[in-house]
Interface confidence: low
């Protein structure tokens, strides 16, 4: 007996009971393929899910979340509270990102900021709750005579790479002995 | 706005074929079924067949052997041939939009086809 | 082949009757039925989906009802513009069938 199920269209399904007639999908169910035994029950977008797609004979509903949540998992299985920038949704609802963390989106958790000192470059631009710090030109940049596009590291600021304080420490040491020999030699000059 | 709008022939000469095309704005083939369906002057609708979305069609079994029904989802048409026309082919010809739960929720407005000598 | 039965051709009533046209199907179909709406200018429109589901945009004095192979469509409180043709259609099985129609005509 040739199986008749096989030619039943997408919206049908093959009604064994009525000599394998292909029947119309009942109301609220679709067959996404042709020679399904079966309609499947459409999703249902309720509550906190709103629906992006109406289901038709042939096709799910496909459901979104509701303003103030966003979608997680396959075909937005779940949907989960939005949090401000700067924040992360913890068990106890959304928290402030703690500091060196930061979140620029309403979802997701708080990330640390980016080190600088490990690619060998400064903070350019400090880092805060919503942003990721922005990172300048390596100490090598800044010597004489080399040309970079990039604007030079401001002064220190919280977050600097050793780099820079050993850098910075030694200019100042070098400063301050050449300072402390020239008081001397004008010293010796007066006592003369 | 969903719309539908059936364009035959008007006139069509007896064991000539009927070719009818069906334009739908508003909406697509690639989500609705279309379902045609006529009715003979002072007599009541006939149910003559569907294509679904996919593309796969039913037809009305008395009408069978003579009836093809086709689309073209990027033209958003469906078209409706009919072979062997005699005189009791002469009718309103509608085509339909078949919603998620199997109803005709849009009609055009139908062409009239006359099948004479 | 299911036929579909609409015993009344025509019917004749008042504004403001309430109006009941009957349908009835030769074998059961699981109340998969629908009425459509047949203006004198040729226009057809959905009223009642499967069985008692009121199409969007439809007056509420319209409503459906049945099982098995019974089915009505009642119109409560009737209106000039409700002047008509009433198809009753079966999609349980294919090849789908209409009934013959029933003409309402206002008194």
């Known amino acids: 007996l040739q199986d008749l199920c096989s030619n039943c269209p997408a919206g049908t399904f093959c009604d064994n009971n009525r000599s394998q007639i292909c029947s119309p999908c009942p109301p609220n169910s679709f067959s996404s393929a042709g020679g399904q035994r079966t309609c499947d029950i459409c999703r249902q977008c309720k509550g906190v899910f709103k629906t992006r797609k109406e289901c038709s004979s042939t096709s799910n509903a496909e459901c979104d979340c509701i303003s103030g949540y966003h979608c997680l998992g396959a075909e937005c299985s779940m949907c989960e509270q939005d949090c401000k920038q700067g924040q992360e949704l913890t068990k106890k609802g959304c928290k402030d990102c703690c500091f060196g963390t930061f979140n620029d989106q309403k979802r997701g958790i708080c990330r640390p900021w980016t080190n600088c000192s490990l690619d060998g470059k400064s903070v350019l631009v400090n880092g805060t709750k919503e942003r990721d710090v922005v990172c300048g030109p390596s100490p090598a940049d800044l010597s004489p005579g080399a040309s970079s596009a990039t604007p030079p590291a401001p002064a220190r600021e919280p977050g600097h790479s050793p780099q820079i304080i050993f850098f910075l420490a030694l200019t100042s040491t070098v400063v301050l002995f050449l300072l402390f020999f020239l008081v001397l030699d004008y010293k010796d000059d007066d006592d003369k | 706005q969903v719309q539908l709008k059936e364009s035959g022939p008007g006139l069509v000469a007896p064991s000539q074929s009927l070719s009818i095309t069906c334009t739908v704005s508003?909406?697509?083939?690639?989500?609705?079924?279309i379902s045609w369906v006529r009715q003979p002057p002072g007599k009541g609708l006939e149910w003559l067949g569907i294509?679904?979305?996919?593309?796969?069609?039913n037809y009305n079994s008395a009408l069978k052997s003579r009836l093809s029904i086709s689309k073209d989802n990027s033209r958003s048409q469906v078209f409706l041939k009919m072979n062997s026309l005699q005189t009791d082919d002469t009718a309103r010809y509608y085509c339909?939009?078949?919603?998620?739960?199997?109803?005709?929720?849009?009609w055009g407005a139908g062409t009239t086809v006359t099948v004479s000598s | 082949d299911i036929q579909m039965t609409q015993s009344t051709s025509s019917l004749s009533a008042s504004v403001g009757d309430r109006v009941t046209i009957s349908c009835s199907a030769s074998?059961?179909?699981?109340?998969?039925l629908n009425w459509y709406q047949q203006k004198p200018d040729g226009t057809v429109k959905l009223l009642i989906y499967?069985?008692?589901s009121l199409h969007s945009g439809v007056p509420s004095r319209f409503s459906g009802s049945g099982s098995g192979t019974d089915y009505s469509l009642t119109i409560s409180n009737l209106e000039p513009e409700d002047i008509a043709t009433y198809y009753c259609?079966?999609?349980?099985?294919?090849?789908?069938?209409f009934g013959g129609g029933t003409k309402l005509e206002i008194k």
């Open positions: 339909a939009r078949g919603a998620g739960t199997w109803y005709f929720d849009v």
């Open positions: 508003g909406f697509s083939l690639t989500t609705y079924a």
């Open positions: 294509i679904w979305p996919g593309g796969g069609t």
């Open positions: 074998q059961g179909i699981s109340n998969y």
């Open positions: 499967y069985t008692s």
């Open positions: 259609q079966q999609y349980s099985k294919f090849p789908w069938t």
